[in-house]
């Protein structure tokens, strides 16, 4: 376990032309606050959920009012560090998002208004216990300067906060085979000789040979998740519960929700439903009310102003989550037809249609034939965003300008011979067959299989196909 710490040094206009306008004015004083979101791993796919390592909100900065005519200076910042506690090992590689939020303090109907000024993101390698790392990130015309570090909470030490340290038993040196705990030279690395088979993920030991379980796990080797299902049974006067075997680890096994929050599995992660007065991915932030602005991305906060009062975030379209922190890409399933470009405007989806198409989803095919001509008596057929010609017999090609060979497809059946003709083609049928394409056998007695041959046409005569 440990804490990620973020120190904001400055937030103000970046170098170069196009300095941003001050976010505050005499008419509309405001103050800043920051939000940090941490995810494990260096790639987007490594993040199991939004802010899977944790998130934190800063305090509000001092109220700032722009001096008329003055350029936007570095804006006054909140005091103190942003601290994101982590319960498990520090992953070493992480992604961060730091958001700068503006709280407007003018006469707002329904309380203060929040808006996102800037968002910076990055991916970094960082060993726990190391020195402060300095960073500069730019978002548009704004520049954010900050430092960060990860430190272990005693008794954990090491670059991942997975080693345990204990005070020295003797003043001069550590026990046999044990190293001093740098930088805590007066402490020694604890021997991690737990009971054989003790779960390395869910168990730990403070004395050799023991196996103590992390919250949510039970059993002699801490391999059994404590279930919240009906199989719990009381044990002794304290009504403590025995574990239930639930196959396969799930994100709610070992309940990651703090402060009495209840855990629900989501399609890829988990979600904590927090009791009144708590919020955060794991209900780890306490005493939050609407005055703290817990709703992101323009979410509307509804709830009382006293610390014990719950709040609810009503999210705008395109966002969800208990704090409106999850963005939904509604264009992902390509709702625009016929190659239209999808635009998620937040309040609505819009499709920008290719030429020849229209409609909310580009589903309507416009008249492609306007101003188009098909040669040699062809007729224009619209469709697919481009005009097509249905050509008269004997012609082909895109505009019916090419002469077609009607016999190319061998249309005469049963060995009939094909002759090109000004009005199409003529089939000279082999003996025993008749019809426009020689498709009908002539009965042995000379009667046709057809009801009657057209006047002036005898079986065996060449048939002209019109």
């Amino acid at each position: 376990a440990g804490v990620f710490e973020l120190q904001i040094h400055s937030f103000g206009p970046g170098p170069g032309p196009g300095a941003p306008r001050s976010p505050c004015s005499a008419r509309l004083p405001c103050r800043l606050f920051f939000r940090v979101c941490l995810k494990p791993g260096l790639s987007e796919e490594a993040a199991e959920s939004p802010c899977a390592l944790g998130a934190a909100l800063s305090a509000r900065g001092p109220v700032y009012t722009e001096q008329p005519g003055a350029p936007a200076p570095d804006l006054p910042l909140p005091d103190g560090l942003l601290q994101v506690p982590f319960r498990d090992a520090w992953p070493g590689t992480f992604s961060f998002i730091i958001e700068t939020w503006r709280e407007e303090l003018g006469d707002q109907i329904g309380g203060p208004a929040w808006s996102l000024l800037a968002r910076v993101a990055g991916r970094r390698r960082l060993a726990a216990g190391g020195p402060w790392a300095r960073d500069i990130q730019r978002a548009g015309a704004w520049e954010l300067r900050f430092s960060y570090r990860a430190r272990c909470e005693p008794p954990a030490v090491g670059t991942a906060c997975t080693r345990l340290c204990r005070p020295r038993s003797a003043p001069s040196r550590c026990g046999p085979g044990l190293r001093p705990c740098a930088p805590l030279e007066d402490e020694c690395e604890a021997p991690l000789v737990c009971r054989a088979g003790c779960s390395p993920e869910h168990g730990f030991c403070e004395q050799p040979g023991e196996c103590r379980c992390l919250e949510g796990w039970t059993g002699p080797l801490c391999t059994v998740p404590v279930s919240t299902s009906s199989c719990l049974s009381p044990r002794g006067p304290s009504s403590a519960t025995t574990g239930c075997l639930v196959p396969g680890p799930g994100p709610c096994d070992g309940n990651p929700c703090a402060n009495g929050g209840s855990c629900s599995e989501t399609p890829r992660s988990f979600e904590c439903t927090c009791p009144r007065g708590f919020y955060g991915l794991r209900c780890e932030v306490s005493g939050v009310t609407c005055a703290d602005g817990p709703c992101f991305n323009g979410g509307l906060c509804v709830g009382g102003a006293d610390p014990d009062s719950a709040y609810i975030c009503h999210c705008p379209p395109g966002f969800q989550g208990s704090n409106c922190e999850k963005r939904v890409d509604r264009c992902s399933l390509q709702p625009c037809r016929n190659g239209g470009l999808c635009l998620d405007l937040g309040h609505a989806l819009r499709c920008r249609c290719r030429a020849g198409f229209a409609g909310p989803r580009c589903e309507h095919d416009l008249d492609d034939c306007a101003g188009r001509a098909c040669a040699n008596g062809g007729t224009c057929v619209e469709g697919g965003g481009a005009h097509r010609c249905s050509c008269a017999l004997g012609f082909g090609g895109r505009d019916c300008r090419e002469r077609a060979d009607p016999c190319a497809a061998r249309p005469c059946a049963h060995g009939g011979r094909c002759y090109a003709h000004f009005s199409g083609l003529v089939c000279a049928c082999a003996p025993g067959y008749m019809g426009a394409r020689c498709e009908f056998p002539v009965h042995p007695d000379g009667a046709s299989a057809l009801p009657a041959a057209p006047p002036g046409l005898r079986p065996g005569d060449p048939q002209r196909y019109l």
Partner: antibody, heavy 124, light 106 residues
């Protein structure tokens, strides 16, 4: 063109284990955002979600059936396998597999393509 | 578990009618998904993320709602629309479906 097809036994005896395979084409479970789920429908009844698996091997099971279900994927074969132990006549149903898409980390975009389904009867 | 309750359970209507099916969730679900199923066939996705039309679905279908109450509307019923319709939530496990609404020809 995206297609999914379920295969497996049509008749199983009570207490036996059912193994169903979903073979799909037109997308890959090595692509970020892709998943495959299993849904069943007893004759004349409503749909019931059973389990799903994502490209990065994140799995979810219906809590009421979790102890009996196992879902696995073979990315190279474009297959997802569901096993269900200790079958009972009440498990008689048409079993469907379907593609699930999630482009937003934890928000499902849609379960947009379904297999034709395979009817599994549990009877001695 | 989040319970999904559809109403009505069955509905008789005529070609050209405007039809509305509602789905009520026992707790907030953020988004709703709607499927159409015809006898002997697999379900087909109609609406995703509450109001977005799936590919190839006619524009007479529309979805709306938020929180716990959602609606599927067919603006002018066509012969091919007579089927059973299901809603589904993807918020919390188990990812439950409604009991279905059977739309029959009057």
């Amino acid at each position: 063109q995206i297609t999914l097809k379920e295969s497996g036994p049509t008749l199983v005896k009570p207490t036996q284990t059912l193994t169903l395979t979903c073979t799909f084409s037109g997308f890959s479970l090595s692509t970020s955002g892709m998943g495959v789920g299993w849904i069943r429908q007893p004759p004349g009844k409503a749909l019931e979600w059973l389990a799903h698996i994502w490209w990065d091997d994140v799995k979810r099971y219906s809590p009421s059936l979790k102890s009996r279900l196992t879902i696995t994927k073979d990315t190279s074969k474009n297959q997802v396998v569901l096993t269900m132990t200790n079958m009972d006549p009440v498990d008689t149903a048409t079993y469907y597999c379907a593609r699930i898409v999630s482009f937003d980390n934890d928000v499902v975009s849609a379960m947009d393509y379904w297999g034709q389904g395979t009817l599994v009867t549990v009877s001695s | 578990d989040i319970q999904m309750t559809q109403s009505p359970s069955s509905l008789s209507a005529s070609v050209g009618d405007r039809v509305t099916i509602t789905c009520s969730a026992s707790s907030s679900v953020s988004y709703m998904y709607w499927y159409q199923q015809k006898p002997g066939k697999a379900p087909k996705l109609l609406i995703y993320l509450t109001s977005n039309l799936a590919s190839g679905v006619p524009s007479r279908f529309s979805g709306s709602g938020s929180g716990t109450d959602f609606t599927l509307t067919i603006s002018s019923l066509q012969p091919e629309d007579f089927a059973t319709y299901y809603c589904q939530q993807w918020r919390h496990n188990p990812f439950t479906f409604g009991q279905g609404t059977k739309l029959e020809i009057k």
